[in-house]
Interface confidence: medium
């Protein structure tokens, strides 16, 4: 399905070597504490049958999930680190709000809603997962939306 | 509450068919796969195959290739197992069961329906 | 397709600590996921992904893992753990189809 052109981020987003050395300090302090080895949030599995040109969407979705269940409420923890790169993520997440796909996006939802059922289904395990993989959330938002 | 609810015991005669349903409630039927599942009498669980409940798309297990089939109902929220060319040795409770997260977690499961093959 | 192997049946003493095993190849990769099956009941999920419960499972069922070895452990097993259990994983090519092991009957005396 065709996407509309809102579905693009700056590469200038990706390009701050101190939000982005920050969030990757984020990700490394979460991950220490995660236990879940053999759970993979953005892997190969979250992207099966979603076409190079859908994945900035997919990836917002997955932005705004991390956001809202995940960052919110784990906000007090991980500083000084969370405190910055929470409103750098909300950031691009409002840039990315007028990103939507023309057609049906089930197969995308299918996919994104494996990947919420596995965090809540770990509970706070998830949480500090989902945290520990913001390295690669960063990554795939650059790759799918510059 | 996720509720997976089987049709109800069937007898069958060797060389028949049967179609078993797995009516789903408590979710969004077209984000999860449906499983089947069958257990012989004092047996272990045989993986039989899965449907995608989005597309149709489905995936058989090499021992029921071309004799099995599963459709789904988008509106009625429900998917069915065909199994043909029936024999004895197809006497079996057969669950359904939903996949749940990225990892075939199997959460929750139907409660099985019983097809005796009887001649 | 690849195989789980699983032991056909093993007892316990009521209150003790009881260990089942579930081997092969997929799980140096992947932990597995451990299903609890009552007579005349449809299985029902107790432990997935490393060691973790859905609600209502009591905490004395863990998991843990070594090399192509998973193990379910009950501690302090209750006459009420009397079943059958399963084993599943994925396939370490990420393809189905999903097998299950074998099932172990668990016997608490």
């Known amino acids: 399905a065709p996407i509309s052109s809102h579905c693009r981020l700056d590469k200038s987003n990706f390009q701050q070597p101190y939000i982005t050395n920050r969030t990757f300090m984020l990700a490394k302090e979460a991950s220490l504490a995660d236990n879940n080895t053999d759970v993979r949030l953005i892997g190969e599995k979250l992207f099966h049958g979603v076409s190079m040109s859908e994945r900035c969407y997919l990836m917002k979705q997955v932005l705004n999930f991390t956001l809202e269940e995940v960052l919110f409420p784990q906000s007090d923890r991980f500083q000084p680190y969370m405190q910055e790169v929470v409103p750098f993520l909300a950031r691009l997440s409002n840039r990315l709000s007028t990103c939507h796909i023309e057609g049906d996006d089930l197969h995308i939802q299918r996919n994104v809603q494996k990947l919420k059922d596995t965090v809540k289904k770990l509970g706070e395990s998830g949480e500090i997962k989902a945290i520990g993989e913001l390295d690669l959330l960063f990554m795939s938002l650059r790759n799918a939306c510059i | 509450e996720v509720q997976l609810v089987q049709s109800g015991a069937e007898v069958k005669k060797p060389g028949a068919s049967v179609k078993v349903s797995c009516k789903t409630s408590g979710y969004k039927f077209a984000l999860y796969d449906i499983h089947w599942v069958r257990q012989a009498p004092g047996q272990g669980l045989e993986w039989m195959g899965w449907?995608?409940?989005?597309?149709?798309?489905?995936e058989y297990s090499q021992k029921f290739e071309g004799r099995v089939t599963i459709t789904r109902d988008t509106s009625a929220t429900t998917v069915y197992m065909e199994l043909n060319s029936l024999t004895y040795g197809d006497t079996a409770v057969y669950y359904c069961?939903?996949?749940?997260?990225?990892?075939?977690?199997?959460?929750?499961w139907g409660q099985g329906t019983l097809v005796t093959v009887s001649s | 397709s690849y195989e789980l192997t699983q032991d056909p049946a093993v007892s316990v003493a009521l209150g003790q600590t009881v260990r089942i095993t579930c081997q092969g190849d997929?799980?140096?990769?992947?932990?597995a996921n451990w299903y609890q099956q009552k007579p005349g009941q449809a299985p029902v999920l107790v432990i997935y992904?490393?060691?973790n419960r859905p609600s209502g499972i009591p905490d004395r069922f863990s998991a843990s893992s070594s090399g192509n070895t998973a193990s379910l452990t009950i501690t302090g097993a209750q006459a009420e753990d009397e079943a059958d259990y399963y084993c599943?994983?994925?396939?370490?090519?990420?393809?189905?189809?999903?097998?299950f092991g074998g099932g172990t009957k668990l016997t608490v005396l």
């Open positions: 069961a939903r996949e749940e997260g990225l990892y075939n977690w199997f959460d929750p």
């Open positions: 992904g490393k060691s």
């Open positions: 599943n994983s994925r396939d370490s090519s990420d393809k189905h189809p999903v097998p």
């Open positions: 449907i995608n409940a989005a597309n149709g798309d489905t």
């Open positions: 997929s799980l140096r990769i992947y932990y």
